[in-house]
């Protein structure tokens, strides 16, 4: 497995009082049984609300690399291939669960963390506020 | 804490050979530091590729209930509010980490699992295959 510079303050896995702590098997089982799940694949280019993917890396987190979507335009692409500003490209955001090494650099001690990621973009009708 | 009918085969938290196992603090930390993350909120109704949320339940998983996006139409909604079948509504999928009790019914032993979920839909230009 991976060797991590060990923090001398790492908690003892056998400490009965280690707060709100459980054993987690990291031999990750992949339930994506569909042999061709056809993930968002090339949708980021073909969408009427296209997006770019940006790499976010953090070695103290699992997964350490998360790809974030950023919508390319404020508006959406119309049938002529132009940006239509009467519509809005917006990110679809989702909280995901990650593991963070805590204390830092401990090879076998983690904390669950929720982070908000943008998964892709969709085209929506804008909310128009009418001023009296 | 909670009383769970205990599986006699639960691994010993102190077993040095328990495979690829780490201590995880379940006090979930919220890293959503953005002051206005504006999650997907009402986009499922306002999108040109609207979606419904469908319930998927599994009592041995956390979260036990996962609401999955299913695109409402094969096509996309045009400016007149009609479905345009020259475009396609497609699901944006994301792999997420969930926790599974393993062995089942063990109160303090879990396994990380990756599952693919549809978090929303986007409108894409179809791939047209021309037959010679």
């Amino acid at each position: 497995g991976i060797t991590i510079p060990r923090n001398p303050g790492c908690p003892n896995s056998e400490d009965k009082n280690f707060p709100r702590t459980v054993m987690v098997n990291l031999n990750i089982h992949n339930r994506n049984t569909n042999t061709n799940p056809k993930r968002s694949s090339d949708y980021y280019n073909r969408s009427t609300s296209p997006w770019n993917l940006h790499r976010n890396e953090d070695p103290e987190r699992y997964p350490s690399v998360i790809w974030e979507a950023k919508c390319r335009h404020l508006g959406c692409i119309n049938a002529d291939g132009n940006v239509d500003y009467h519509m809005n490209s917006v990110p679809i955001q989702q909280e995901i669960l990650v593991l963070r090494r805590e204390p830092p650099h401990c090879p076998n001690s983690f904390r669950l963390e929720k982070i908000l990621v943008s998964v892709g973009c969709t085209c929506v009708t804008p909310i128009v506020h009418h001023v009296a | 804490g909670i009383t769970i009918p205990r599986n006699p085969g639960c691994p010993n938290s102190e077993d040095k050979n328990f495979p690829r196992t780490v201590m995880v603090n379940l006090n979930i930390h919220n890293r959503n530091t953005n002051t206005n993350p504006k999650r997907s909120s009402d986009y499922y109704n306002r999108s040109t590729s609207p979606w419904n949320l469908h319930r998927n339940e599994d009592p041995e998983r956390y979260p036990s209930v996962i609401w999955e996006a299913k695109c409402r139409h094969l096509g996309c909604i045009n400016a007149d509010g009609n479905v345009d079948y020259h475009m396609n509504s497609v699901p944006i999928q994301q792999e997420i980490l969930v926790l599974r009790r393993e062995p089942p019914h063990c109160p303090n032993s879990f396994r990380l699992e990756k599952i693919l979920v549809s978090v929303g839909c986007t409108c894409v230009t179809p791939i047209v295959h021309h037959v010679a």
Epitope: - | N30, N36, V65, I96
Partner: antibody, heavy 126, light 107 residues
Framework: EVQLVQSGAEVKKPGESVKVSCKAS????????ISWVRQAPGQGLEWMGG????????DYAQKFQGRVTITADESTTTAYMELSGLTSDDTAVYYC???????????????????WGQGTTVTVSS | EIVLTQSPDFQSVTPKEKVTITCRAS??????LHWYQQKPDQSPKLLIK???HSVSGVPSRFSGSGSGTDFTLTINGLEAEDAGTYYC?????????FGPGTKVDIK
């Protein structure tokens, strides 16, 4: 349809303890949490604490820390709230509420209280 | 600890009138705010979740808006059965506390 049914009214003396039960039916008990909320006569709602059934994790409001114990039994799908060292200020209606913990619309685990028990009146009087 | 304040404390309203109740958080809570209705001698009932999401079985005259620190519950066309106390509740961070409530009665 989830239903939460609480135990009956209790009359206690100062210094005693009270244990209120909340029997859940419908839905997967291990999948959600149960929170306890109290309401003194003519007052607002006060969150006391809650349990995430899947992990058995309990959180308490600081005001009640050391005096309240929240537990749950998955085999009987019942949650319990025990409050010790009762005083007249603890006279209130005690409610259990379901905390869905669902992966929904951008949230990894939701925390709205979507179902409530009917309430248990606890009267503390000498 | 996040503190929620509501205004007004009390509102006396004529049927069919529009009612607006506001809830302010002492710090940013994203859209992690919920609204409950409590009628006399009844348990609270969830009306709106996550600031603006309607709840199944709740009449469409109830709507919510806002994010960050300022939130609004609107009742469009009050009906006699809407009399009761309305509470906001945050689930952004522990403890998951409630606002002090707004009592609505019918003139």
């Amino acid at each position: 349809e989830v239903q939460l049914v609480q135990s009956g009214a209790e009359v206690k003396k100062p210094g005693e303890s009270v244990k209120v039960s909340c029997k859940a039916s419908g839905g997967s008990f291990s999948g959600y949490g149960i929170s306890w909320v109290r309401q003194a006569p003519g007052q607002g709602l006060e969150w006391m604490g809650g349990i995430t059934n899947f992990f058995g994790i309990v959180d308490y409001a600081q005001k009640f820390q050391g005096r309240v114990t929240i537990t749950a039994d998955e085999s009987t799908t019942t949650a319990y709230m025990e409050l010790s060292g009762l005083t007249s200020d603890d006279t209130a209606v005690y409610y259990c509420a379901r905390d869905p913990n669902e992966f929904w619309n951008g949230y990894y685990a939701t925390h709205d209280f979507d179902y409530w028990g009917q309430g248990t009146t606890v009267t503390v009087s000498s | 600890e996040i503190v929620l304040t509501q205004s007004p404390d009390f509102q006396s309203v004529t049927p069919k009138e529009k009612v607006t109740i506001t809830c302010r958080a002492s710090q940013n809570i994203d859209s992690d705010l919920h609204w409950y209705q409590q009628k006399p001698d009844q348990s609270p009932k969830l009306l709106i979740k996550y600031a603006s999401h309607s709840v199944s079985g709740v009449p469409s005259r109830f709507s919510g808006s806002g994010s960050g620190t300022d939130f609004t519950l609107t009742i469009n066309g009050l009906e006699a059965e809407d009399a009761g106390t309305y509470y906001c509740h945050q689930s952004y961070s522990l403890p998951f506390n409630f606002g002090p409530g707004t009592k609505v009665d019918i003139k």
